[in-house]
């Protein structure tokens, strides 16, 4: 291809790509009509004055994954048509003032994964058409007031994975067009009131993995268009009653991995689009009446790995759409017979790893569509007669790791289990704990010296789409029959390319190997 440097490949579509460790300077001559230039994985350490002078038609320039640590202020001179500039994954510590001067068409500027220590208002003052600014993965400790004041058209700003300890309430005030703001993985301890007031078009706000302890009551009151709010893995201990009241568009809210002790009734103000709510790994001790009553469309509610010991009978009022409820690994000893009565569409419930001693006979009375019930690792000695009889779709029931008392009172349950053996799965079966002479024997085949009629094992409905189960054998919920191991906190695995905390522990659902749904 005419005019293509030997170290590069050039396509007829005016695209030039230069890669390889042997490249130590910007190759020349570059084709005069190049519209896209990529310089990747080279040993270039600096950009001198005007290396791109003869390719003024350039629209996209990617200089990524190099050894680049120094740029001359005039490096990008004559690139007035440039719309996309990426300097990501280099070793830049300092940006020269005026570096982006003359880039009047620039819309996307990617400076992520460098070693930038600071930014100044003068850095971006010429970038009035900028729509996207990526600064994540640097060493920024603070953002000075005015840094973004000229970026009135900005729609996406990523400041994640820096070392920010505080944010000025004025720093975002002119970003009225901003749709995405990411501040995840910093060291923020609080967000001043008014910080987000100017962000009337904000759709996504990522604050996860900071050290935020308190949220101001009106922090999100101007963000009526917010759709995704990430607050997980902070130190939030309480939620002001009105904090989520003005978020009618919200469809994703993560609060797991905080220090929440209680949830006040109606705390989740009308959110007609919220379909999943993840509250696992907090310190919630009780659930009052109507705490979720505004979440009429909620389909999945995860409350596992808290310290819940009491659930008010009306706690789940309003959750008429709920399909999956996870309450495993809490401190529940008793449940009111009406607690699940409003959950007419519930399909999966996980109650394992609690301290349940008994269940009311009507506990599942109105939940006719239940397909999966997890009750393993509790303190159950028996279950009321007919507790599961009306659950025609039930195809997965886990009862192991309970101290079943195998006296004559167990016969109705034993007979039902015999009839419904396939529903129990094949991995682990319930065994007797008492009396001592039958301890360890299978509850299903135990001889209680009473004749048991011969049974026909019916065909069980096929497995439902059940909640998550661990797909490796190393999680506590897959342990053997004798195990009563408490679940530990998840091992966090934070990745570079994602903005959301990822955990490598599948046990927030805590389902067993057999639960493949």
């Amino acid at each position: 291809y005419h005019g293509c440097p030997s170290e590069c490949t050039c396509s007829r579509a005016s695209q030039v790509e230069c890669t390889g460790a042997r490249i130590v300077a910007v190759p020349t001559p570059l084709p005069w009509n190049a519209m896209s230039l990529q310089i990747l994985n080279t040993h270039i350490t600096e950009l001198n004055e005007s290396p791109f002078l003869n390719i003024s038609a350039l629209i996209a320039l990617r200089i990524e994954k190099n050894e680049l640590s120094r740029i001359t202020p005039g490096a990008f001179r004559n690139l007035g048509s440039l719309r996309y500039l990426s300097l990501a994954n280099n070793k830049l510590q300092v940006l020269p003032i005026g570096l982006f001067q003359g880039l009047d068409s620039l819309e996307s500027l990617l400076l992520s994964s460098n070693q930038l220590l600071q930014i100044q208002p003068a850095h971006f003052s010429q970038c009035s058409n900028l729509k996207e600014l990526q600064l994540h993965g640097n060493h920024l400790e603070y953002i000075p007031d005015g840094a973004f004041d000229h970026l009135v058209g900005l729609t996406k700003l990523n400041l994640g994975k820096n070392s920010l300890t505080h944010i000025s309430p004025r720093v975002f005030q002119h970003l009225g067009n901003l749709q995405v703001l990411r501040l995840y993985e910093n060291r923020l301890t609080d967000i001043p009131m008014g910080t987000f007031d100017g962000l009337v078009n904000l759709q996504e706000l990522a604050l996860q993995q900071n050290q935020i302890g308190l949220l101001s009551p009106g922090l999100f009151h101007n963000n009526h268009n917010l759709q995704r709010l990430y607050l997980s893995n902070n130190h939030i201990s309480q939620l002001p009653p009105s904090v989520f009241m003005q978020l009618p568009q919200l469809n994703r809210l993560t609060l797991f991995g905080n220090s929440l002790k209680e949830l006040s009734p109606g705390i989740f103000g009308p959110m007609p689009n919220l379909r999943e709510l993840w509250l696992y790994d907090n310190h919630i001790s009780s659930l009052p009446d109507n705490v979720f009553s505004n979440l009429r469309q909620l389909q999945v509610l995860i409350l596992s790995r808290n310290q819940i010991s009491f659930i008010s009978p009306g706690a789940f009022n309003g959750l008429t759409e709920l399909r999956e409820l996870s309450l495993h690994t809490n401190a529940l000893q008793d449940l009111d017979g009406n607690v699940f009565r409003m959950l007419a569409n519930l399909q999966n419930i996980s109650l394992q790893n609690n301290r349940l001693r008994q269940l009311p006979g009507n506990i599942f009375a109105n939940v006719n569509g239940l397909m999966a019930i997890q009750l393993q690792n509790n303190q159950l000695e028996n279950l009321p007669l007919g507790i599961f009889d009306h659950l025609g779709k039930l195809c997965e029931l886990r009862l192991y790791d309970n101290p079943w008392r195998c006296d004559s009172d167990i016969l109705p349950l034993r007979n039902w289990l015999l009839l419904n053996q396939p529903r129990l799965g094949t991995d682990t079966v319930p065994v007797c704990f008492s009396p001592a002479n039958v301890r360890g024997q299978s509850l299903i085949i135990i001889n209680v010296n009473v004749a048991v009629p011969s049974v026909h094992v019916p065909e069980v409905p096929s497995y439902p789409e059940t909640p998550w189960y661990p797909d490796t054998p190393s999680y506590p919920d897959t342990t053997s029959v004798s195990s009563t191991t408490e679940l530990t906190s998840p091992v966090e695995d934070y990745t570079d390319l994602t903005t959301i905390q990822v955990t490598d522990d599948r046990s927030v659902w805590g389902m067993t190997q057999a639960q493949s749904g």
Epitope: E324, S462, P464, E465, D471, V502, R506
Partner: antibody, heavy 119, light 110 residues
């Protein structure tokens, strides 16, 4: 622009395994469910299962349990489906698709990967 | 599993005319708020494309000549005025339980 780009066509011997990849871009990978769907030649669509990169959780259609294994690599924003003990009836186009919430429709699909099992 | 029966198997409609596809479920897939029922279009050599979610909600970017209706066990996809580019196979899907699809309806121009 939301994109799911799948790996190329594969021809495999009966009894072998195949691993199909699905590279996601243009959206926050860990914030969406990734489904896998099978379409045998001239046939309709069959749901295999889903994976949620957020927590690494999986759900399978019981029919494909033991046949398909779904995994993700969040560092490369890629989902994988491995099919083992291949037989001629596993010959199909396999699609990955994205869903916003667990019960939502699949709003973006990969272009499909043809797997042919033949001796 | 929930069985979805689509009818007809194929359909020939004149350009500009109405096309109606039905999908019947073996059990209800609706609550008071939602019907867990979605419609897709698939053209030869292409992946399926989402048209309608939750029975009646038009996916963004889909022409408004497509509409969905129904609840419980019976659902309908309607193309109000068939265009040449609408020639395709249409599938219904339920996400109430293990996801299943209908057998497909092939729409052609008469």
């Amino acid at each position: 622009e939301v994109q799911l780009v799948q790996s190329g066509a594969e021809v495999k011997k009966p009894g072998s395994s195949v691993k199909v990849s699905c590279k996601a871009s243009g959206f926050t990978f860990t914030d969406y469910y990734i489904h896998w769907v099978k379409q045998a030649p001239g046939q309709g669509l069959e749901w295999i299962g889903l994976v949620y990169p957020y927590i690494g959780g999986t759900n399978y259609n019981q029919k494909f349990k033991g046949k398909a294994t779904l995994t993700v690599d969040t560092s490369t924003t890629t989902a994988y489906m491995e099919m083992s003990s291949l037989r001629s009836e596993d010959t199909a186009v396999y699609y990955c698709a994205r869903g916003d919430n667990k019960y939502d429709a699949m709003d973006y699909w990969g272009q499909g990967t043809t797997v042919t099992v033949s001796s | 599993d929930i069985v979805l029966t689509q009818s007809p198997d194929s359909l020939a409609v004149s350009l500009g005319e109405r096309a109606t596809i039905n999908c019947r479920h073996s059990q209800s897939v609706s609550t008071s708020s939602y019907s867990y029922m979605h419609w897709y279009q698939q053209k030869p050599g292409q992946p399926p494309k989402l048209l309608i979610k939750y029975a009646s909600s038009l996916e963004s970017g889909v022409p408004d000549r497509f509409s969905g209706s129904g609840s419980g066990t019976d659902f309908t996809l309607t193309i109000s005025s068939l265009q040449a580019e609408d020639v395709a196979v249409y599938y219904c899907e339920q996400s109430w339980e293990i996801r299943t699809f209908g057998g497909g309806t092939k729409v052609e121009i008469k």
